[in-house]
């Protein structure tokens, strides 16, 4: 990536890292308003299976692994990107490496959920306080999960699907920060590991993933009021290990693996019309990216 200053624009969709033949160090940003891509400062270490989030206007890259010709190293790293300076800086590492991690943000704190270290599949969860640059373990999930989708709704943290080391999962659970406890919620209609999970209009969406046999293009959403999962329109492409985010009331899914190819496709879901459309292509196909949107 280039080392010049990032243009000062509105909300951008950032995609960090990923995998194509090896873990990648790219940081790129898509501007939905004009359809352009920006090439930004590379991650200091290549990584795939990471997660991205934004706190206080800064982009954080959490966990993952560096799968390269030289070896394969799971990551406990937390790195912070400042869009104003186009620079990465390291933060305090997590207590354990977490590849194929999920993250969510509540009250400015980053929750790192599950993931794997070698053949260990974590149920542990830890919380990062940016002001103190410290991680602290919180209550573990009821289930070990890697390739877990994480979303925050109404200050509750949801962990959806994933892989427990033996089975791909359709189960989901919810973390209550005030009680420091997890509770199971209604299971999805579909087993999904490596799905894209996000929140839109008071619903949790789970898009794509892998059911243990095939990549999926189906999408379902959870209504917290009725505690039910309902299918919505499927994506055009089957994909697992995809990136997902919400921008101006629409869901964007980025890349992933369809069982044959590493996708460069970016699709956008409009909840008003219940339709998916291809909006752009990434500069190259990849899976296992970390994605987040900058705040205004």
């Amino acid at each position: 990536g280039s080392m010049g200053h990032a243009p000062k624009v509105g909300r951008l969709i950032y995609t960090a890292g990923g995998y194509f033949r090896q873990s990648l160090s790219y940081l790129e940003a898509y501007n939905p308003s004009d359809g352009t891509w920006l090439d930004l400062a590379d991650l200091q270490v290549p990584r795939s299976g990471l997660a991205g989030c934004v706190v206080g206007g800064l982009l954080y890259a959490v966990g993952g692994r560096n799968n390269s010709p030289d070896g394969n190293t799971d990551s406990s790293a937390l790195d912070c990107y400042n869009p104003m300076t186009n620079q990465w800086s390291p933060c305090a590492p997590m207590s354990v490496p977490r590849n194929r991690i999920g993250v969510g943000v509540i009250d400015g704190h980053i929750y790192a959920v599950g993931g794997s270290h070698g053949c260990i599949h974590h149920n542990s969860v830890e919380r990062y306080e940016p002001e103190r640059d410290e991680w602290h373990l919180v209550a573990p999930m009821l289930t070990r999960r890697i390739g877990v989708g994480v979303a925050v709704l109404n200050r509750l943290l949801y962990a959806v699907g994933g892989f427990d080391g033996t089975n791909r999962l359709n189960s989901a659970e919810c973390y209550y920060p005030e009680r420091n406890e997890w509770r199971m919620i209604t299971a999805m209609n579909t087993i999904r590991s490596g799905a894209g999970v996000c929140v839109l209009h008071n619903c949790i969406y789970a898009a794509g993933g892998y059911d243990g046999q095939d990549q999926l293009n189906s999408v379902e959403r959870y209504d917290v009021e009725t505690e039910t999962w309902t299918f919505v329109a499927p994506m055009k492409h089957r994909r697992s290990a995809l990136g997902i985010t919400v921008h101006q009331g629409r869901i964007y899914v980025l890349g992933g693996y369809d069982g044959h190819t590493f996708l460069d496709s970016v699709e956008c879901y409009d909840p008003d019309t219940d339709t998916w459309s291809e909006v752009t292509r990434m500069t190259s196909g990849r899976s296992g990216v970390g994605v987040a949107v900058t705040m205004e």
Partner: antibody
């Protein structure tokens, strides 16, 4: 019945290339990670490469990284090992194996012999 | 890389004997160890996974155990068809590594 059948082995000169195939039946290769393991004549087993069906990520032993490429064609239910820049020390019987979630190879092919010699 | 040191490299035993083969990991591998049996000219066959779980269809005379980083394969009463080479394998961390093998021969 689960079966794995390797093919494509043979005699090749140093620096040459071969492509091994592993045809699966009785299960979908999209449902398990597929691994290649080799065994030099009179020696032990050495893990070579693997492919993850969920993320598409591949892993390689240091001894073959940059020279070998593992891939899978789910429509043909077949995995492949493309071997380039072959060396005498790559001479071995190459096995493909299915590795379910719990990390041990429960089914193996019969093996195919690769001989690298001038 | 994690080394799996297997011992003995060979042993001679009679039918009916109790046979024990050990693998020591150079660092912690949790219980992510498997044992395989291989006969000449044939592919390996899985016997034990996750250190102590007997694979489906494998006779109950085979068992596996773990003590820290030491892993043991035991054949409680050796049968004629058990004369073969046995390998341990760790899948705890990349790269997966095998022991050098133990050849069980007829005394």
């Amino acid at each position: 019945e689960v079966q794995l059948v390797e093919s494509g082995g043979g005699l090749v000169q140093p620096g040459g290339s071969l492509r091994l195939s592993c045809a699966a039946s009785g299960f979908a290769i999209s449902a398990s990670s597929i691994h290649w393991v080799r065994q030099a004549p009179g020696k032990g087993l050495e893990w070579v490469a693997s492919i993850d069906p969920e993320t598409g990520e591949t892993l390689y032993a240091k001894s073959v990284a940059g020279r070998f490429t593992i891939s899978a064609d789910t429509s043909k239910n077949t995995a492949y090992l493309q071997m380039n820049s072959l060396r005498a020390e790559d001479t071995a019987v190459y096995y493909c194996a299915r590795m379910p979630a719990w990390g041990s190879a429960d089914y193996w092919g019969q093996g195919t012999l690769v001989t690298v010699s001038s | 890389d994690i080394q799996m040191t297997q011992s003995p490299s060979s042993l001679s035993a009679s039918v009916g004997d109790r046979v024990t083969i050990t693998c020591r990991a150079s660092q912690s591998v949790s219980s992510a160890v498997a044992w395989y049996q291989q006969k000449p000219g044939k592919a390996p066959k899985l016997l034990i996974y996750s250190a102590s779980s007997l694979y489906s269809g494998v006779p109950s005379r085979f068992s596996g155990s773990r003590s820290g980083t030491d892993f043991t394969l035991t054949i409680s009463s050796l049968q004629p068809e058990d004369f073969a080479t046995y390998y341990c394998q760790q899948s705890y961390s990349f790269p997966s590594t095998f022991g050098q093998g133990t050849k069980v021969e007829i005394k």
